[in-house]
């Protein structure tokens, strides 16, 4: 009886444990962009390299076709850093004439698409004006935070600029998502 | 039979279970650096306050000698802000001119160091240009990240510019990494 | 007895354990702020959303009057973005003249109120010059770290203006923390 | 605009302790280290120490034995000891910031100190 | 610790002329973190240049540093009435920071 007793008490209170080593996981890294075309007045999502040097996915986290596919629901820890790079702003020009303008900028998004839902629901923004002058820049947008992704939902990297994005360094532009 | 069925069963489920309070774990602050000399053609590394104030290692993993020591093989969320200031950056100057020019650039390095691999890896990167005209500037580079970690890796933070970094304050500058 | 012997042999080894899915967790997103009264020489406080679009807060982490309030003693993992816009800093009026003086800035710190302990303690802070010329500006500061907190602690998000904080979408501006 | 104002004694015997104080207005105190350099007569400069607004310390090696430097942040002040002062240590000693780092923008009027029996 | 020789000891210029000015260290001094500075009698010094190149705040163009290693010179294009003092050299890529002894620009 006591043996009967014990074993429903183990299985209700440890049943929703897991191995941490278990959860699913990826660290993606930035790889050259082709070209391609975008569907009007969206960002274009950044492709990623999944297995080689730093990159990985790991315990049923898939990457493909530009997506991180979440293989089960909880809670997920999300962040991505696109390093960005360009020429003088154009901006330059125009203070010059001494009037001011609507700036420049760069902007990365982190998107969840979800099959049964028609619109994407953006996660993430990071969005910095850029009114350099005289010289060539370059800057990180850092993003992270947690949220709750149901199994099948997928994520993806938005950018407002491909062509400005910096793919040369895996250590640059990356994108990672856990579960907790 | 039955009790005996059941033991190897719970080992083998629950085996990789560990308590969460037991991973290795740390947040590092930012002490005044001592002007030194360092390698040639390599960032210096920063060091840093490991038991004062916000500062704590726990669990193994500890810090020597301007690194942070990985005790333990697994999936590490690793993470850095240095803040940056100086003054007005030269290409105020080279702007005046009309020409085009190399920015002042910082930049944070996150490099992981294998004893057995001769060559330091670059975890992550920040780098950004300054071209700061007519007054001092401040600004913070924000790191993080998932990276799978040997037990025996060592980390560090390196900065382009150990005299540019604001050592004043721990909730400015900090690195540390935990496993997930 | 071997029963005897081998339930508090698990209990020993396995009394730390928890399911992750009920650990505090919260993700606070942007409202828009109303003007009040501050305390002198303190940055003021954000409020935020917790329970509508991409906000939530569960197992026992509460949010109430700008404050998240810690449940349970443990290492927590705290971020927040705040995206910041503006109109051409008066420094470009300075710059004009010739003159140097001390930038515009913008600030966010994330701070902990123990109410054991007369003076809040301030965990993270992002803070950066901005001197635009010539057009309006926007951008983000991003925190994010782990801290040792205790049963009771409250947490809140300081900014340096908060007329200048872009409220105007939850994936801009948000604040969450996670026990690890 | 970030002034630094500093007092103390004058004329010392030697043996005696040099004690100077320095007040910073117009900036902010804890976002800086703040530092004691001395200059003989018609000689160059002597960097003397450092303390942050949470009171960490740098001391040069020659000097560290015989000096104290302490900050109260709610005055905004900084203060320098330096115990068994001799005739060697006559000089105009001068509170300064540092910014960015080990170099200094803003300084004090200068106090000259002289030992002499 | 390192020491800062300068030179010449005095420099006697017109206004209008271009000065040089040398700072030797007796080492080399890491990532080039030297300092120039500016002192006119009775007050305290001025910063001018910084990280052996970069003009402080506020510091017109007319001044300009350079060199690395153990090598390092400050150059004023154009000498004004209010650039005649002492200028001094500071080194701060090894602890102890430490200061040359000066060179005096005088108006000949």
């Known amino acids: 009886l006591k043996g009967q007793e014990f074993a429903p008490s183990h299985q209700q209170v440890y049943a929703p444990l897991r191995a941490d080593g278990d959860k699913p996981r990826a660290h993606l890294t930035v790889v050259r962009q082709t070209p391609t075309q975008h569907f009007k007045n969206q960002f274009p999502a950044l492709h990623w390299e999944h297995e080689l040097g730093l990159a990985f996915t790991k315990n049923r986290m898939n990457y493909t076709n530009k997506f991180l596919l979440i293989p089960e629901s909880g809670d997920y820890f999300i962040y991505s850093q696109v390093t960005f790079r360009g020429m003088t702003s154009e901006c330059s020009e125009i203070r010059r004439a001494g009037r001011p303008n609507k700036p420049d900028s760069i902007t990365v998004v982190i998107t969840k698409v979800t099959d049964s839902y028609p619109e994407p629901t953006q996660l993430l923004m990071g969005t910095k004006s850029v009114c350099e002058v005289g010289s060539n820049w370059f800057q990180p947008i850092y993003l992270g935070a947690m949220f709750s992704l149901q199994e099948g939902d997928k994520l993806m990297v938005n950018v407002s600029d491909i062509s400005l994005v910096d793919y040369t360094k895996e250590d640059k532009t990356f994108f990672g998502a856990f579960l907790l | 039979l039955k009790g005996q069925e059941f033991a190897p069963s719970h080992q083998q489920v629950y085996a990789p279970l560990r308590a969460d309070g037991d991973k290795p774990r740390a947040h590092l602050t930012v002490v005044r650096q001592t002007p030194t000399q360092h390698f040639k053609n390599q960032f210096p590394a920063l060091h840093w306050e490991h038991e004062l104030g916000l500062a704590f290692t726990k669990n193994r993993m500890n810090y020597t000698n301007k690194f942070l020591l990985i005790p333990e093989s697994g999936d590490y969320f690793i993470y850095s802000q240095v803040t940056f200031r100086g003054m007005t950056s030269e290409c105020s100057e080279i702007r005046r001119a009309g020409r085009p020019n190399k920015p002042d650039s910082i930049t944070v390095v996150i490099t992981k160091v294998t004893d057995s691999y001769p060559e330091p890896t670059q975890l992550l990167m920040g780098t950004k240009s300054v071209c700061e005209v007519g007054s001092n500037w401040f600004q913070p580079i924000y790191l993080g990240a998932m990276f799978s970690l040997q037990e025996g890796d060592k980390l560090m933070v390196n900065v382009s510019d150990i005299s540019l970094v604001d050592y004043t304050k721990e909730d400015k500058t900090f690195f540390g990494a935990f496993l997930l | 007895l071997k029963g005897q012997e081998f339930a508090p042999s698990h209990q020993q080894v396995y009394a730390p354990l928890r399911a992750d899915g009920d650990k505090p967790r919260a993700h606070l997103t942007v409202v828009r702020q109303t003007p009040t009264q501050h305390f002198k020489n303190q940055f003021p406080a954000l409020h935020w959303e917790h329970e509508l679009g991409l906000a939530f807060t569960k197992n026992r982490m509460n949010y109430t009057n700008k404050f998240l309030l810690i449940p349970e003693s443990g290492d927590y993992f705290i971020y927040s973005q705040v995206t910041f816009r503006g109109m051409t800093s008066e420094c470009s009026e300075i710059r004009r003249a010739g003159r140097p003086n001390k930038p515009d800035s913008i600030t966010v710190v994330i701070t902990k109120v123990t109410d054991s302990y007369p003076e809040p303690t301030q965990l993270l802070m992002g803070t950066k010059s901005v001197c635009e010329v010539g057009s309006n500006w926007f951008q983000p500061i991003y925190l994010g770290a782990m801290f040792s907190l205790q049963e009771g602690d409250k947490l809140m998000v300081n900014v340096s203006d908060i007329s200048l904080v872009d409220y105007t979408k939850e994936d801009k501006t948000f604040f969450g923390a996670f026990l690890l | 605009q970030v002034q630094l104002q500093q007092w103390g004694a004058g004329l010392l015997k030697p043996s005696e302790t040099l004690s100077l104080t320095c007040a910073v207005s117009?900036?902010?105190?804890?976002?800086?280290?703040w530092t004691w350099i001395r200059q003989p007569p018609g000689k160059g400069l002597e960097w003397i120490g450092e303390?942050?607004?949470?009171?960490?310390?740098n001391y040069n090696p020659s000097l560290k034995s015989r000096v104290t430097i302490s900050v109260d942040t709610s005055m905004s002040q900084f203060s320098l000891k330096m115990t068994s002062v001799t005739a060697a240590d006559s000089a105009v000693y001068y509170c300064?910031?540092?910014?960015?780092?080990?170099?200094?923008?803003?300084w004090g009027q200068g106090t000259l100190v002289t030992v002499s029996s | 610790e390192i020491e800062l020789t300068q030179s010449p000891g005095t420099l006697s210029l017109s206004p209008g002329e271009g000065a040089t000015l040398s700072c030797r260290a007796s080492?080399?001094?890491?990532?080039?973190?030297l300092a120039w500075y500016q002192q006119k009698p009775g007050q305290a010094p001025r910063l001018l240049i910084y990280?052996?190149?970069r003009r402080a705040t506020g510091i017109p163009d007319r001044f300009s540093g350079s060199g690395s290693g153990t090598d390092f010179t400050l150059t004023i294009s154009r000498l004004e009435p209010g650039d005649f003092a002492v200028y001094f050299c500071?080194?701060?890529?090894?602890?102890?920071?430490?200061f040359g002894g000066g060179t005096k620009v005088e108006i000949k």
């Open positions: 300064a910031r540092d910014y960015p780092n080990w170099v200094f923008d803003y």
């Open positions: 117009g900036g902010s105190f804890s976002d800086y280290f």
């Open positions: 303390i942050s607004h949470s009171g960490r310390t």
């Open positions: 080492q080399s001094v890491f990532n080039s973190y």
């Open positions: 990280g052996a190149s």
């Open positions: 500071q080194q701060y890529g090894n602890s102890p920071l430490t």
